[in-house]
Structures are given as C-alpha cells and as structure tokens.
C-alpha cells in the first residue's frame, strides 16, 4: 500500500531572486483533490492553504508582499489528500537582492570572442563579502559561485556559441542575501571557421560550479545541449 503521495512542484513567480521590498509568490503544485497544502520555511511550518473546492484545484499560491532578508531562505511544500501526505517538494532557494552595494562585472579578453577562446568573467565589490555569483540570464538562470576578498574570477574555459548571452554578477552576504546586480555584460561568441575543432563537444558549464537551472517554462528552448531539471532545487548548497 502506498504510504506517501508524489512530491509537489515548488517555484517562485516572477523569479526566485526578489529585490528587497518587492513582492513574490511561492507556488506549490500537487494533485487535484488535495485538501491541504503546507509551506515550510527553513524546516518549520510557515503557512497553510486549504483549496476550495479541492477536486478542481491542483495548485496553491503563497504571497509575500514585501521581500526582506528574514523571508529569504529555503522553502518546501507538502500536500495532503485525505489522511495521506505527500513527499516534500524539492527545496526552493528564495533570494533577496538589492542589498547594500553594486558590483562591477568585466570580461576578459573582451565581450566578443571566437569559439574555443578561454573567457573569464571578473566580479568586483569593494565591501565586505567573500562570495560572488555570476548569473547567465535566460528563461532559466545559471548561477555560478566564486570566492575572493574583493574580486572573484569566473573562468568559463574554452567557449562555444552556447555561451552567448547576457551575464550579471552579485556579491553575496550570505547564501540568500545578494547585492544589487552589476550592469549586464553581453558575451558574443562567433565560430572560428579555421579552427572548428577548438570548440568543446559539450557547451555546458562545469558541473561542480553551476547551480541548478531554475524557473524554466518551456522545454528544449535553451541552446545548451544538456537538459536541466525545471523545478526549483538546491540552488546554492
């Protein structure tokens, strides 16, 4: 006999990165017929919703009208059908941004490179932080962590056209409190038709440094060849 129901999906709208004092909605999608949803924050019960009528609703929303550092952290949700509870959802990392200062993002050798060239981003912030985050904007957001006293290096290695995109960086005061974003830097990679062998086969980023793709709304639209989990999961652990 089944002891638990399948885990629900959890995500944040419009985004998991929320500027301070702005609003955000945490969505939890379970099953039709669920009579109760619970939202947990940092392991403790945070909010409860009982949808009516349960047989016509499979998603609930928890509204946060005014984001601040106390609301930033890890959320998960569960739901109940009758007496049977679901497995907990994956963890959603909700981040507050626009805290304190604005870093500077630069790219070496420059914003226009040839496929196969090694590219490094530099994120600099002169105030007290030692963790930096590089974010490639998109339907989902790649997040890469770097460390340094006032500056962090983000080596992308030999790039391909899959690395084209808009990048920003943040200083991080803790895992869930980030600075204002840097000005965006666009990276344009064009193929080197003399040396196509320079381009690596897999244009994704180093697996040990990239966080999970979050908030993808459509499958297969990223240029990157790897497929990513679309649910909000363990971004920064």
């Amino acid at each position: 006999q089944q002891q638990t129901l399948p885990k629900p999906f959890i995500w944040a709208e419009p985004h998991f990165m929320v500027p301070k004092e702005k609003q955000v909605t945490i969505c939890c999608q379970g099953n039709y017929g669920a009579v109760e949803y619970q939202l947990h924050f940092e392991g403790s019960l945070f909010a409860v919703d009982r949808p009516k009528p349960p047989e016509r609703i499979n998603k609930v929303q928890f509204y946060i009208p005014d984001m601040n550092s106390r609301m930033a952290g890890q959320y998960s949700c569960i739901y109940r059908v009758g007496e049977l509870w679901s497995e907990p959802s994956n963890l959603l990392d909700l981040v507050v941004t626009e805290m304190y200062d604005t870093p500077t993002l630069s790219v070496h050798p420059g914003p226009e490179v040839i496929s196969g060239e090694k590219v490094t981003f530099y994120c600099r912030l002169d105030t007290a932080t030692s963790m930096f985050l590089l974010l490639k904007e998109g339907r989902s957001s790649h997040v890469q962590r770097g460390y340094g006293k006032v500056q962090a290096e983000f080596p992308l290695g030999p790039v391909t056209t899959a690395h084209r995109g808009t990048y920003r960086c943040f200083g991080s005061y803790n895992n869930h409190a980030w600075s204002f974003p840097s000005e965006p830097v666009k990276l344009l990679v064009t193929g080197d038709i003399e040396n196509t062998s320079l381009a690596p086969e897999d244009p994704t980023f180093p697996a040990d440094t990239w966080g999970t793709y979050l908030l993808t709304t459509e499958t297969g639209l990223q240029k990157d060849h790897a497929l990513w989990d679309h649910t909000a999961q363990n971004l920064l652990r």
Partner: antibody
Framework: DVQLQQSVAELVRPGASVNLSCTAS????????MHWVKQRPEQGLEWIGM????????KYAPKFQGKATITADTSSNTAYLHLSSLTSEDTAIYYC???????????????WGQGTTLTVSS | SIVMTQSPKFLLVSAGDRVTITCKAS??????VAWYQQKPGQSPKLLIY???NRYTGVPDRFTGSGYGTDFTFTISTVQAEDLAVYFC?????????FGSGTKLEIK
C-alpha cells in the same frame, strides 16, 4: 509591444550617401544586438552587419566593408545604416532586425522592421 | 565566409503535400541555424531557431532538424497560406549568411 520602425522609401542620386534609420520601441536596444539585412528585388537576403548598441562595437560582412556604416543612438533607441557612394547595385530593400531579447538575448532574429526601399537613380 | 547551399530553388506543391527543404553549410555551424518565411511584400518571419526549436506561435506542421553541416526544414501538411519564400540562415560565424531561398508555390 516590440516594434522596429523604418522609413518606407528613399530615392537618392548615384554617388550620394544615405542614412537609414530603425527606431525600436518596446525594448531597449542596449540589451541586444541590432542587424541590417539587404534584399535586392527578387533576390535573397544578404547580411550587412551588426552593432552592439551598448558599446558601439560593429561587425560587417566583407562585401559591405567601406560601403556600410552601422551606428546606434541609445538615447533615441535607434539604429542607423549609412550607405555611401551609392550605385544602382545598392537599390534594394534594407531591413533592420534584432537578435531576440526577452530579458536576455538569443541569437536569432525575432523581430524585423518593415524594410526601407532604397532606389538609386538619376 | 560560410556558404549555405539551399535546395531546391522552387517547389510546386498541392495543399496537403509534405515538403522538405535542405540547407548544407560549407563548414560546421553547430546548431546555429534558423529558418525564416517571407511572404510576398512582407518582412521575413522567424519559424525555427537553433536548428530545431519552433518559435512561439508557429504551427507544429513546421519542423527543423540537423546539426553541423546538414539541415532540413519540413512542412508536414502544406496549406495555401504557406505560399512564401523560405530561407535558412547561420549565425555561427561572422559574416552571418543566408541560403539563397526556396520559393514555395501552391498548385
């Protein structure tokens, strides 16, 4: 609503120059790349070049080097194509197009202007 | 420059037919290929990007495939409103280049 607005037509004399404009609305051109494409009557599409309006960096097809100059004015959200020493070979429709931008850019043309018909004739 | 060799130049088909257009790049262009439709008197419109992704709002009768040098564009069931010229385009390497176009005419 994203739009790229171009003037409908230009008539110029051989040997003269012309400046074609492409005014964007619904997005900031600084956040993407703007391209120009030529189409001669009953012929295919030819990529002229592109600009990164954020820094003014340009790329051109070798064929249009010296013939075309692409600029952008971010304050008016407008990209320009300047064509010099015009001949009948330059008679064509000129389109501006943007590389897709929806909070970030992707490299395909999702929006095109309606095209400016340039006629070079004495 | 990378040359995109597109074939055929013309297609005369009946409504309901299946149509395939090919584009061959002179060198590998990864999957940086898009397909555009240009109806008479109009600007080109994006149909397919990154070789196989259908753009928002494009009917699912339009599909694309390929990687490297060989690319295919298919209309599974041609309709009267598909009368147009179809172009492939690579933006892997500058100068970016287009195929010469395929004119689709309906009987």
């Amino acid at each position: 609503d994203v739009q790229l607005q171009q003037s409908v037509a230009e008539l110029v004399r051989p040997g003269a120059s012309v400046n074609l404009s492409c005014t964007a609305s619904g997005f900031n051109i600084k956040n993407t790349y703007m391209h120009w494409v030529k189409q001669r009557p009953e012929q295919g599409l030819e990529w002229i070049g592109m600009i990164d309006p954020a820094n003014g960096n340009t790329k051109y097809a070798p064929k249009f080097q010296g013939k075309a100059t692409i600029t952008a004015d971010t304050s008016s959200n407008t990209a320009y194509l300047h064509l010099s020493s015009l001949t009948s070979e330059d008679t064509a429709i000129y389109y501006c197009a943007r590389w897709a931008y929806d909070g970030y850019y992707e490299s395909y043309f999702d929006y095109w202007g309606q095209g400016t018909t340039l006629t070079v004739s004495s | 420059s990378i040359v995109m060799t597109q074939s055929p130049k013309f297609l005369l088909v009946s409504a309901g037919d299946r149509v395939t257009i090919t584009c061959k790049a002179s060198q590998s262009v990864s999957n940086d290929v898009a397909w555009y439709q240009q109806k008479p008197g109009q600007s080109p419109k994006l149909l397919i990007y990154y070789a196989s992704n259908r753009y928002t709002g494009v009917p699912d009768r339009f599909t694309g495939s390929g990687y490297g040098t060989d690319f295919t564009f298919t209309i599974s069931t041609v309709q009267a409103e598909d009368l147009a010229v179809y172009f492939c385009h690579q933006d892997y390497s500058s100068p970016f280049t287009f195929g010469s176009g395929t004119k689709l005419e309906i009987k």
